[in-house]
């Protein structure tokens, strides 16, 4: 496989990762697919320092991250352990609220206007952040 040694155009480098910040909204799954087609993933927040970096770039706007519980437990899209990892939920969140009237609960996590996290309906068209790690060998499959 090939290694990415510098960030693509229009991506921001920070602590050996590259970040891309959208300026329009998509549903969580569509945002996730956009990132994956760019060999990236929705942002995975692993520290307070990374939280502050992302928060600085997105401003006070609802923005998807790579955290969901669509299959039961909360999971980060890159496999980072949720239980032992960094968390920054708003008080009393996540609450899997059903009162929005859109059907089902709330299975996808986003940054709120103050940067803290909330769970919300995955179909809401929020902005999103893609992340890809530098020096990570790409998983290019062998041709059969």
């Amino acid at each position: 496989g090939s290694e990415r040694t510098c960030c693509p155009v229009n991506w921001v480098e920070h602590e050996r990762s590259c970040y891309w910040f959208s300026r329009s909204g998509k549903a969580w799954a569509d945002a996730d697919n956009y990132c994956r087609l760019e060999d990236a993933h929705l942002v995975v927040v692993t520290s307070w320092e990374e939280q502050k970096f992302v928060q600085h770039h997105i401003g006070p706007v609802n923005t998807w991250m790579g955290l969901h519980d669509q299959n039961g437990p909360w999971k980060w899209v890159d496999g980072t352990d949720y239980e032992t990892g960094f968390k920054n939920w708003r008080p009393e969140q996540p609450d899997d609220w059903y009162g929005h009237g859109l059907g089902g609960g709330e299975d996808c996590a986003h940054f709120t206007d103050d940067g803290r996290w909330n769970d919300d309906v995955c179909q809401r068209p929020y902005r999103w952040v893609c992340e890809t790690e530098l020096d990570k060998a790409s998983q290019e499959p062998p041709l059969l």
């Epitope: 090939s2 693509p8 697919n33 956009y34 060999d39 790409s138 290019e140 499959p141």
Partner: antibody, heavy 121, light 107 residues
Framework: EVQLLESGGGLVQPGGSLRLSCAAS????????MTWVRQTPGKGLEWVSA????????FYADSVKGRFTISRDNSENTLYLQMNSLRAEDTAVYYC??????????????WGQGTLVTVSS | DIQMTQSPSSVSASVGDRVTITCRAS??????LAWFQQKPGKAPKLLIY???SLQDGVPSRFSGSGSGTDFTLTISSLQPEDFATYYC?????????FGPGTKVDIK
């Protein structure tokens, strides 16, 4: 100048297989997602599949999932579409296209000239 | 899947005419819409992306507008080389779906 050249089309019997190729030049192939789109007189333009620049992530239309496989060889600047269990409704002109990420989505430009796949007994 | 419809399905026009083609999506999204031109025997060519951004090299007589569910492609003054079929495509979500096309022919 960006150029995409498809090959590998032809006549195949139902249930048969075919592998399409798309030779790319004029850009850094591994930096771009690529896609296949097909066109039939009856169904018009139909997106078939897409693959990320590294080849690590791929996406398929429901109509071809489990039968078609998209892949790429970045050392050879070539995109592939392996088509198995072909059906009459897969008859179409198949185009490859570069998928450029701008403004939060992927835009197909340019396209190759197309290769005709005919599935018939 | 998001269904895309176009109207009219065909239009007859003369050189110099203003031509407007409409594309409607079955569900709303932002501006994740492209317009393509296709001539017989040729591959589609990208004209407009992100609903209103003109692709490099495309004449300024082409313009796009809209967001949500309703989008428009306008040719301000039709030229002889503009007689072709025009398609819209949504790139909001997989599968990226196309409209059925609008054929612009000579009156």
């Amino acid at each position: 100048e960006v150029q995409l050249l498809e090959s590998g089309g032809g006549l195949v019997q139902p249930g048969g297989s075919l592998r399409l190729s798309c030779a790319a030049s004029g850009f850094t192939f591994s930096s771009y997602a690529m896609t296949w789109v097909r066109q039939t007189p009856g169904k018009g333009l139909e997106w078939v599949s897409a693959i990320s620049g590294s080849g690590g992530n791929s996406f398929y239309a429901d109509s071809v999932k489990g039968r078609f496989t998209i892949s790429r060889d970045n050392s050879e600047n070539t995109l592939y579409l392996q088509m198995n269990s072909l059906r009459a409704e897969d008859t179409a002109v198949y185009y490859c296209a570069k998928a450029r990420a701008v403004a939060g989505s992927h835009w197909f430009d340019p396209w190759g000239q197309g290769t005709l796949v005919t599935v018939s007994s | 899947d998001i269904q895309m419809t176009q109207s009219p399905s065909s239009v007859s026009a003369s050189v110099g005419d203003r031509v407007t083609i409409t594309c409607r999506a079955s569900q709303g999204f932002s501006t994740w819409l492209a317009w393509f031109q296709q001539k017989p025997g040729k591959a589609p060519k990208l004209l407009i992306y992100a609903a209103s951004s003109l692709q490099d090299g495309v004449p300024s007589r082409f313009s796009g507008s809209g967001s949500g569910t309703d989008f428009t492609l306008t040719i301000s003054s039709l030229q002889p080389e503009d007689f072709a079929t025009y398609y819209c495509q949504q790139t909001n979500s997989f599968p990226f779906t196309f409209g059925p096309g609008t054929k612009v022919d000579i009156k």
